[in-house]
Interface confidence: medium
C-alpha cells in the first residue's frame, strides 16, 4: 500500500507541494489522515497528519468544546493507494478577519498562543490579548494547555493559550480518537504563563503548607519540573485509538499518559510510520483571525472551522 505522508503543525506542512508518498510496511492495510482544528476567540489553527495506518476504513468527525475553546476533529481511513487526501486541511478565513476592535474588552488579560511553536509560547514570550465576551458567553479566565494529535505513528503537539470561560479548571480536557485538547484555567491578569503544575486546590481553600521542623536550619527547596517535549514520535507499539484512562485528560506529553486501547467507529490510528522529512515546523503561526460569534461545528464536512459572521 502507498499512502500520502505529511505532518502539519499550524504551518503548511501538508500544503500541496509538500506532499510525500510512502510505501507502507507489511500488514499495513489502510492510509490515515487526521486533522484537529482549534479555535480561540483570538484565532484558529490546525494540526494534521497523513500516513500509513491500521484498523479498518471509516470516518470519524467530532466537535468539542473546552470552556469556550472549540475543537473540531476529523479522522479518515481508507484502503486504496494514496487515498488519504480527502480532508480539507485549510482553515477557512473568518469574515470579517481582524475585527477584534469591534468587541469591548471585559478587563481580563491573557497570554495567547494560537498556532505558535513551543519555543515561541514559553512563559511571558507570547502576545498578550484582551479578553471579550462573545455570543453571550463570558471569557474572563485564562487557559494554558496543549493540543495533541496522534496518527500514523506520529504525535503532533502544540501549546494552546488564550481566554476561556472557566477561571479555575485544572488539568481538564476533551478527547477524540487520537486527539486531546487539555490544560488548566486561571484567574487574573496574564496568569497563564505556565499552569503545568497547577494542583486541584480551589482558590478559596488555602493549600496545605508543610512547615519544616523547628530544629531544621536549612531552607526548604522546591523541586523543579522540567518541561516535557510533546512533539515526538508515538510509541512504536501498535495500538489503536488512545484515550487517557482518567476522567480528565492529562496535561502532559502523550508518553506520560496512562493509555488504554479502544476501538471507535471503525477507525484506528497507529500503524506503519509515515516518514516525513523536515515538513513540520516551517512557516510560522497560523492566521490570527478573530471570532465574532460562535456557531456549532458541523457533524460532517471538510476539516475546517466554519466561517463566522461579523458584526
Amino acid at each position: 500500500l502507498e499512502c500520502y505522508s505529511c505532518v502539519q503543525k499550524a504551518d503548511d506542512g501538508c500544503s500541496p507541494h509538500r506532499m510525500k508518498t510512502v510505501k507502507c510496511g507489511p500488514g499495513v492495510d489502510v492510509c490515515t489522515e487526521a486533522v484537529g482544528a482549534v479555535e480561540t476567540i483570538h484565532g484558529q489553527f490546525s494540526v494534521a497528519v497523513r500516513g500509513c495506518g491500521s484498523g479498518i476504513p471509516g470516518k470519524n468527525d467530532r466537535g468539542l468544546d473546552l470552556h469556550g475553546l472549540l475543537a473540531f476533529f476529523q479522522l479518515q481511513q481508507c484502503s486504496e493507494d494514496r487515498c488519504n487526501a480527502k480532508l480539507n486541511l485549510t482553515l477557512r478565513g473568518l469574515n470579517p478577519a481582524g475585527n477584534e476592535s469591534a468587541y469591548e474588552p471585559n478587563g481580563a488579560e491573557c497570554y495567547s498562543c494560537v498556532g505558535l511553536s513551543r519555543e515561541k509560547c514559553q512563559g511571558s514570550m507570547p502576545p498578550v490579548v484582551n479578553c471579550y465576551n462573545a455570543s453571550g458567553r463570558v471569557y474572563k479566565g485564562c487557559f494554558d494547555g496543549n493540543v495533541t494529535l496522534t496518527a500514523a505513528n506520529v504525535t503532533v503537539s502544540l501549546p494552546v493559550r488564550g481566554c476561556v470561560q472557566d477561571e479555575t479548571c485544572t488539568r481538564d480536557g476533551v478527547t477524540g480518537p487520537g486527539f486531546t485538547l487539555s490544560g488548566s484555567c486561571c484567574q487574573g491578569p496574564r496568569c497563564n504563563a505556565d499552569l503545568r503544575n497547577k494542583t486541584y486546590f480551589s482558590p478559596r481553600i488555602p493549600p496545605l503548607v508543610l512547615l519544616p521542623p523547628p530544629t531544621t536550619a536549612a531552607p526548604s527547596t522546591r523541586a523543579q519540573n522540567s518541561s516535557s517535549t510533546t512533539s515526538t514520535a508515538a510509541p512504536t507499539t501498535t495500538t489503536s485509538i488512545i484515550k487517557p484512562t482518567t476522567a480528565q485528560a492529562s496535561h502532559t506529553s502523550p508518553h506520560e499518559m496512562d493509555l488504554e486501547v479502544i476501538q471507535e467507529e471503525g477507525a484506528s490510528l497507529s500503524g506503519g510510520a509515515a516518514g516525513h522529512g523536515g515538513t513540520a515546523g516551517h512557516g510560522g503561526a497560523a492566521g490570527h483571525q478573530d471570532r465574532s460569534n460562535m456557531e456549532k461545528y458541523p457533524g460532517k464536512g471538510g476539516a475546517q472551522i466554519p466561517a463566522k459572521g461579523g458584526s
Epitope: 509538500r18 510512502v22 478565513g93 510560522g284
Partner: antibody, heavy 117, light 112 residues
Framework: EVQLLESGGGLVQPGGSLRLSCAAS????????MSWVRQAPGKGLEWVSY????????YYADSVKGRFTISRDNSKNTLYLQMNSLRAEDTAVYYC??????????WGQGTLVTVTS | QSVLTQPPSASGTPGQRVTISCTGS?????????VHWYQQLPGTAPKLLIY???KRPSGVPDRFSGSKSGTSASLAISGLRSEDEADYYC???????????FGGGTKLTVLG
C-alpha cells in the same frame, strides 16, 4: 471556470517598483495556496514566492528575498506581488498560479515586467 | 543551474514514443516528494500535464504518462503528434531549499 488574471506589469527602471495583481475567480480563493512563478525571456520557469490560504505562511526565492512582498486580500479574491529595488535580471513574464492537487493546477496568462534603463 | 535536471531537447517523429527524464536528489524526488509535469506551448502559459507522479488532470490525453523511481522521474509521450511540440518542465518540493523547484525544461520537437 477557474480564471487567474494578472495585471500591473510594465517598463520600469532599475531600482524602481511595481505592484502586480492577480484577480481570481471560479474557485474559493480563501481556501487556496497561491504562488508567483516567473519566466525570463527564452529561459525556464522559476518559482518566486508562495503564500498560504490565510496569508500567515510565506516563502520567497533567495533571489527576491527582501525586495519582493507577496500578499493577498481574500475579500477581493486578489493576490499581489510588490516588487521593489528591481534589477535587470527581474525582467520576466510573471505568472500567478494556484496550488491544487499537489501542483500548480491553474495559471494566469502572465504579465511582462521589463527592467531597463 | 536548475535543481532538477532535464535534457535541454528531445525529438521524435509523429506516432513515435518519446521519453523525457528528470533527475533530482535525496532532498526532493528522492525524499519521496511527488513530481509534476507542465507543458508550455509556444507563446502560452504553462499547463499542468501530470501531477502526483502519474496522474492526469481531466482533458489530458492518455498518451501522456508519468513515472517515478528513486531520485528520478520521467514523462512518456506515445503516439507523438505535431501539437505536442512544446517545452516540458518537471517540478517537485525540495526539503533543503524549502521551496518548489523546477527542472530547466526540455524543448520537444516533432520532426517531419
Amino acid at each position: 471556470e477557474v480564471q487567474l488574471l494578472e495585471s500591473g506589469g510594465g517598463l520600469v527602471q532599475p531600482g524602481g517598483s511595481l505592484r502586480l495583481s492577480c484577480a481570481a475567480s471560479g474557485f474559493t480563493f480563501s481556501n487556496a495556496w497561491m504562488s508567483w512563478v516567473r519566466q525570463a525571456p527564452g529561459k525556464g520557469l522559476e518559482w518566486v514566492s508562495y503564500i498560504s490560504s490565510s496569508g500567515s505562511t510565506i516563502y520567497y526565492a533567495d533571489s527576491v528575498k527582501g525586495r519582493f512582498t507577496i500578499s493577498r486580500d481574500n475579500s477581493k479574491n486578489t493576490l499581489y506581488l510588490q516588487m521593489n529595488s528591481l534589477r535587470a535580471e527581474d525582467t520576466a513574464v510573471y505568472y500567478c498560479a494556484r496550488e491544487g492537487l499537489w501542483a500548480f493546477d491553474y495559471w494566469g496568462q502572465g504579465t511582462l515586467v521589463t527592467v531597463t534603463s | 543551474q536548475s535543481v532538477l535536471t532535464q535534457p535541454p531537447s528531445a525529438s521524435g517523429t509523429p506516432g513515435q514514443r518519446v521519453t523525457i527524464s528528470c533527475t533530482g536528489s535525496s532532498s526532493n524526488i528522492g525524499a519521496g516528494y511527488v513530481v509534476h509535469w507542465y507543458q508550455q506551448l509556444p507563446g502560452t502559459a504553462p499547463k499542468l500535464l501530470i501531477y502526483d507522479n502519474n496522474k492526469r488532470p481531466s482533458g489530458v490525453p492518455d498518451r501522456f504518462s508519468g513515472s517515478k523511481s528513486g531520485t528520478s522521474a520521467s514523462l512518456a509521450i506515445s503516439g507523438l503528434r505535431s501539437e505536442d511540440e512544446a517545452d516540458y518542465y518537471c517540478a517537485a518540493w525540495d526539503d533543503r531549499l524549502n521551496r518548489p523547484v523546477f527542472g530547466g525544461g526540455t524543448k520537444l520537437t516533432v520532426l517531419g
